[in-house]
C-alpha cells in the first residue's frame, strides 16, 4: 500500500503566440480545481476500469477575477497535494490524466457551473520511494507544470511497496532469510503471506494471514463473484455473507446526467451516455475542442476547431462512447467453453472455468478418470467434467462395487420366470414360449416361429442366457 502524490506548480498560458483568453472575468469570477486519474500499465487500453489505480480531486483554488487589459497570468492554485492512495502493489508503470476544471461563481441558477479548461495525459515509469519527478504538459494554449512521486505507507517498502518492514526482534541481525530494510537499516524485511488459498487475482492482504477482496468479489478466499441473481434489486452495498447486493437508493434516481444525457446503472455506480458535444461523469462538460484532447483510448478527434463547433471522436476498434471512454462488451460473444464465466479485464479476456475444465478458454476437459478405479472389471468413461463407470455384467453402482440383480429389469418375456446365475441370468419360459428371453412363441404344430430350439432342449425347458 502507498500514496501517489501530485503537486501542481503552475497553470497558465503556454509559450508562443495565441495566448488563451482568461477563464475568469469581472462579471464571472471563477476558481480552479484539479482532478487526477491513474491507470496501471503503460497503455491506457490496459486499464481495467476508468481509473483503476485511483483518482483524486483537489480543493478549490482562490477566487480569481481578471484584471481588464492584463494578459492572462498563471492562475491561482489550490493549496496542498493531490493524493491518490493505492491498496495493492505500485505497478511501476502507469498512465495519468490530469484535468484542470473551472468553477464559475456568477449568479448561475442552481449553483456554480463547472467546465473543463484543459486535460493532459501521459504514460510514465516510476519506482515507489524515489524522488519527486518534474513534468511540463501542454493542452492547447495552456501549460501545466507539476511534480509527482509514489511513496509507500509503513510498514511497506520497496519500489513496488510489496515488502514489509518490522522492528528487529534482536538488536544485531534479522531472522533467517530476512534482509535488513533499506533505508531503514534498524528494521527487518517481513514476508507478507496472505491466507492460504486467497485468490491471487481478486484478493490481497495488508497483514499476514488475511484475505481482503477486491470490489466485485466475496467469500473467505475472494473466489466468489458478487451475484445479483438471487437478490430482489441489484443495488446497494454488498453483503459478504450472501454475496448479494442489498436494496438501496438507485444511482440513476432523479437522472444525474445533464445536458440530455441518459443514465444507466452499473455494478458500482451509474454511467451517463452523453449527447455529442458533452462529456464528463454527468455530461456536464461542454465547449470542448479537439485541442483539449477529449478522445480517450487513442480515439481520433475530428472537427471541433472552436468551442461552437462539435467535435467527433472516431474510436479505435473495441472502444465506444462519445469520447471513446467505454469498452465494448466482448464477453457477449461467449468465448468461454464448457460453461465458463467470461471476464473482460480490458487488456485481456479471462475465463473462470467450471469444475473439471481448464485452459484459457476452458477448452481442456480434465482427466476425471485419473486415479479413479472402477471395481470388478469396470471401465472408466469421461464426460462433462465427471467420471462414470461402465460396469461388467453382474455389477453396478458408481464404482461397480455393488452386485447387480440381473433379474431386476424383468428380462424374461411372456411370463417367464427369471433366475440369477453366476454368469448372467436364466429364463424359465411359460408353456408355449421359448428362447433365451422366452421371446419366441411355439406353434401348435411343434415348430417354433423363429429359430429352432437347440438340440437336446425341449420347449418349456429353462434357457440359460449367456
Amino acid at each position: 500500500a502507498g500514496v501517489f502524490e501530485l503537486q501542481i506548480h503552475s497553470f497558465g498560458p503556454g509559450p508562443g503566440p495565441g495566448a488563451p483568453r482568461s477563464p475568469c472575468s469581472a462579471r464571472l469570477p471563477c476558481r480552479l480545481f484539479f482532478r487526477v486519474c491513474l491507470k496501471p500499465g503503460l497503455s491506457e487500453e490496459a486499464a481495467e476500469s476508468p481509473c483503476a489505480l485511483g483518482a483524486a480531486l483537489s480543493a478549490r483554488g482562490p477566487v480569481y477575477t481578471e484584471q481588464p487589459g492584463a494578459p492572462a497570468p498563471d492562475l491561482p492554485l489550490p493549496d496542498g497535494l493531490l493524493q491518490v492512495p493505492f491498496r495493492d502493489a505500485w505497478p511501476g508503470t502507469f498512465s495519468f490524466i490530469i484535468e484542470t476544471w473551472r468553477e464559475e461563481l456568477g449568479d448561475q441558477i442552481g449553483g456554480p457551473a463547472w467546465s473543463l479548461l484543459a486535460r493532459v495525459a501521459g504514460r510514465r515509469r516510476l519506482a515507489a520511494g524515489g524522488p519527486w519527478a518534474r513534468d511540463i504538459q501542454r493542452a492547447g494554449a495552456w501549460e501545466l507544470r507539476f511534480s509527482y512521486r509514489a511513496r509507500c505507507e509503513p510498514p511497506a517498502v520497496g519500489t513496488a511497496c510489496t515488502r514489509l518492514c518490522r522492528p528487529r526482534s534482536a538488536p544485531s541481525r534479522c531472522g533467517p532469510g530476512l534482509r535488513p530494510c533499506a533505508p531503514l537499516e534498524d528494521e527487518c524485511e517481513a514476508p507478507l503471506v496472505c491466507r492460504a488459498g486467497c485468490s491471487p487475482e481478486h484478493g490481497f492482504c495488508e497483514q499476514p494471514g488475511e484475505c481482503r477482496c477486491l470490489e466485485g468479489w466475496t467469500g473467505p478466499l475472494c473466489t466468489v463473484p458478487v451475484s445479483t441473481s438471487s437478490c430482489l434489486s441489484p443495488r446497494g452495498p454488498s453483503s459478504a455473507t450472501t454475496g448479494c447486493l442489498v436494496p438501496g437508493p438507485g444511482p440513476c434516481d432523479g437522472n444525474p446526467c445533464a445536458n440530455g444525457g441518459s443514465c444507466s446503472e452499473t455494478p458500482r455506480s451509474f454511467e451517463c451516455t452523453c449527447p455529442r458535444g458533452f462529456y464528463g461523469l454527468r455530461c456536464e462538460v461542454s465547449g470542448v475542442t479537439c485541442a483539449d484532447g477529449p478522445c480517450f483510448n487513442g480515439g481520433l478527434c475530428v472537427g471541433g476547431a472552436d468551442p461552437d463547433s462539435a467535435y467527433i471522436c472516431h474510436c479505435p476498434p473495441g472502444f465506444q462512447g462519445s469520447n471513446c471512454e467505454k469498452r465494448v462488451d466482448r464477453c457477449s460473444l461467449q468465448p468461454c467453453r464448457n460453461g465458463g464465466l467470461c471476464l473482460d479485464l480490458g487488456h485481456a479476456l479471462r475465463c473462470r472455468c467450471r469444475a473439471g475444465f481448464a485452459g484459457p478458454r476452458c477448452e481442456h476437459d480434465l482427466d476425471d478418470c485419473a486415479g479413479r478405479a472402477c471395481a470388478n472389471g469396470g471401465t472408466c468413461v469421461e464426460g462433462g467434467g465427471a467420471h462414470r463407470c461402465s460396469c461388467a455384467l453382474g455389477f453396478g453402482g458408481r464404482d461397480c462395487r455393488e452386485r447387480a440383480d440381473p433379474c431386476a429389469a424383468r428380462p424374461c418375456a411372456h411370463g417367464g420366470r427369471c433366475y440369477a446365475h453366476f454368469s448372467g441370468l436364466v429364463c424359465a419360459c411359460a408353456p408355449g414360449y421359448m428362447g433365451a428371453r422366452c421371446e419366441f412363441p411355439v406353434h401348435p404344430d411343434g415348430a417354433s416361429a423363429l429359430p429352432a430350439a437347440p438340440p437336446g432342449l425341449r420347449p418349456g425347458d429353462p434357457q440359460r442366457y449367456l
Partner: nanobody, 120 residues
Framework: EVQLVESGGGEVQPGGSLRLSCAAS????????MGWYRQAPGKQRELVAG???????IYAESVKGRFTISRDNAKNTVYLQMSSLRAEDTAVYYC??????????????WGQGTLVTVKP
C-alpha cells in the same frame, strides 16, 4: 498479427437483403469464437450474431428470424445473411474474433467495419 477484413456493406431499401463476409488471416492457430457486432450512430456497439466458443450460434433478439450467420472453417470466414432489412438495422457492422495464435495465446480482434444503410 491477425487481420479481419469485412465486405458486403452498402445501401439497400427496407425489406431488402445483404450478405456480409469477414475473412480472418494472419498467424491463426484456430478461431475460438467469431461473429458480428454493429454500432448505430449515437448508440452502443451490440452483438448481432456469432459463433460462441462452444460453436453454438447466438443472435440478438432484434434480428432473430431475419439474419443468419454461417461460416467456412477452411477459409476462416464468417458470413452474415441479412434479410427483411429495416431502417433500424442501419449501422456500421464490425467483425470480431477470439483467436488462438500459434503461440497458443488467445487474442480478441476487431475488423475496421462496413457500413450498412437501409433507407427508402
Amino acid at each position: 498479427e491477425v487481420q479481419l477484413v469485412e465486405s458486403g456493406g452498402g445501401e439497400v431499401q427496407p425489406g431488402g437483403s445483404l450478405r456480409l463476409s469477414c475473412a480472418a488471416s494472419g498467424s491463426i492457430f484456430s478461431i475460438n469464437a467469431m461473429g458480428w457486432y454493429r454500432q448505430a450512430p449515437g448508440k452502443q456497439r451490440e452483438l448481432v450474431a456469432g459463433f460462441t466458443g462452444d460453436t453454438n450460434t447466438i443472435y440478438a433478439e432484434s434480428v432473430k428470424g431475419r439474419f443468419t450467420i454461417s461460416r467456412d472453417n477452411a477459409k476462416n470466414t464468417v458470413y452474415l445473411q441479412m434479410s427483411s432489412l429495416r431502417a433500424e438495422d442501419t449501422a456500421v457492422y464490425y467483425c470480431a474474433a477470439d483467436v488462438q495464435l500459434f503461440s497458443r495465446d488467445y487474442e480478441f480482434y476487431w475488423g475496421q467495419g462496413t457500413l450498412v444503410t437501409v433507407k427508402p
